[in-house]
């Protein structure tokens, strides 16, 4: 006899990285017929929702109108059908960004590289942080962690065209409080370049495209909650 229901999916919209003072919605998707959903924050009950009518709703939303460092941390949710509770969802790491300062991101040997070359990103922030995060924009938001006094190095190894894309970095003051994002660096990987001598380092589009990133990520996120859930779960562990 089944003692628990399948675990729900948990994710954040528009993104798990939330600029301070901005809004975010934590979504929990269970089963139709669930009469109660509970959202837990750092192991304690945070909010409850009872969908009406339960048989027509399989997802609830917990709205946070004003993100701050106290709201950043690990969330999970569970749901109940009758007297039977589900397994807890995977953990969602909700991160507050735009704290304090802005790091700078550079790439060696440059933003235009040839397939097979080894590439290293350098993220630098002069204020008190020793953890840095490098993100490649895209649906699953790959995150790498690095450590250093004022800068961290992120070696990519011999690159392929799969490494193409736009990268940003953050300084991390703790696991869930990050700096402003760096300016983007767009990495172009080609099989052969006529001449990459002194290929420009500067970004190919302006800083305000961070908003566009959140939107494109959201679009992908809605297509594949399971992948997003897994990414968020493994983000900082």
């Amino acid at each position: 006899q089944q003692q628990t229901l399948p675990k729900p999916f948990i994710w954040a919209e528009p993104h798990f990285m939330v600029p301070k003072e901005k809004q975010v919605t934590i979504c929990c998707q269970g089963n139709y017929g669930a009469v109660e959903y509970q959202l837990h924050f750092e192991g304690s009950l945070f909010a409850v929702d009872r969908p009406k009518p339960p048989e027509r709703i399989n997802k609830v939303q917990f709205y946070i109108p004003d993100m701050n460092s106290r709201m950043a941390g690990q969330y999970s949710c569970i749901y109940r059908v009758g007297e039977l509770w589900s397994e807890p969802s995977n953990l969602l790491d909700l991160v507050v960004t735009e704290m304090y300062d802005t790091p700078t991101l550079s790439v060696h040997p440059g933003p235009e590289v040839i397939s097979g070359e080894k590439v290293t990103f350098y993220c630098r922030l002069d204020t008190a942080t020793s953890m840095f995060l490098l993100l490649k924009e895209g649906r699953s938001s790959h995150v790498q962690r690095g450590y250093g006094k004022v800068q961290a190095e992120f070696p990519l190894g011999p690159v392929t065209t799969a490494h193409r894309g736009t990268y940003r970095c953050f300084g991390s003051y703790n696991n869930h409080a990050w700096s402003f994002p760096s300016e983007p660096v767009k990495l172009l990987v080609t099989g052969d370049i006529e001449n990459t001598s002194l290929a420009p380092e500067d970004p190919t589009f302006p800083a305000d495209t961070w908003g566009t990133y959140l939107l494109t990520t959201e679009t992908g996120l809605q297509k594949d909650h399971a992948l997003w859930d897994h990414t968020a779960q493994n983000l900082l562990r």
Partner: antibody, heavy 115, light 107 residues
């Protein structure tokens, strides 16, 4: 065209410090890594380190970490390398090179450490 | 640190001859390898970057290739100005390291 201008020679006394310069032109200085390389008379080349003028990010060869300090002056598009506590072992030609792949090279500065 | 073992250390050859210089990397460097030319007055110029890409303005008689951890610079037909020193340089991993150099002499 791309140019990296370095003084031809510097003569300094043992124990002193020296600041070598490398003035860049013909490209957007702040966008490119600047490297420094040492060559002792009749010897091969040794990479000292690099600096990115825009971010200030640096990467040093461990061997030169206590000897060399790399800086830039963005307003004059000039890269600098300060060498401290000089000894005769520091007598060498020092080259700057621009670009992540050491694309372009200066003519080198001959540093002589002698009393 | 990555060691770059360059051979030969010196090479005597005739005008018009085809020669190859080799560097062996002690660790994987991908295609992050340059070939540099140094003239007697100390002037350094890059010939090849990313293992096989020819720098602009460099004669087509110069070419670069790779076989496993061995990287080669080939000069297809030697001209008088080619009799100078050559170095390989890996820029894959810090500290970047140079080969010990090859002195190309006229026979």
């Amino acid at each position: 065209q791309v140019q990296l201008q370095q003084p031809g020679a510097e003569l300094v006394k043992p124990g002193a410090s020296v600041k070598l310069s490398c003035k860049a032109s013909g490209f957007t200085f702040t966008n490119y890594w600047m490297h420094w390389v040492k060559q002792r008379p009749g010897q091969g080349l040794e990479w000292i380190g690099m600096i990115h003028p825009n971010s200030g990010s640096t990467n040093y060869n461990e061997k030169f970490k206590s000897k060399a300090t790399l800086t830039v002056d963005k307003s004059s598009s000039t890269a600098y390398m300060q060498l401290s506590s000089l000894t005769s072992e520091d007598s060498a030609v020092y080259y700057c090179a621009g670009g992540g792949r050491l694309d372009y090279w200066g003519q080198g500065t001959t540093l002589t450490v002698s009393s | 640190d990555i060691q770059m073992t360059q051979s030969p250390s010196s090479l005597s050859a005739s005008l018009g001859e085809r020669v190859s210089l080799t560097c062996r990397a002690s660790q994987d460097i991908g295609s992050s390898l340059n070939w540099l030319q140094q003239e007697p007055d100390g002037t350094i110029k890059r010939l090849i970057y990313a293992t096989s890409s020819l720098d602009s303005g460099v004669p087509k008689r110069f070419s670069g290739s790779r076989s496993g951890s061995d990287y080669s610079l080939t000069i297809s037909s030697l001209e008088s100005e080619d009799f100078v020193d050559y170095y390989c340089l890996q820029y894959a991993s810090s500290p970047f390291t140079f080969g010990s150099g090859t002195k190309l002499e006229i026979k």
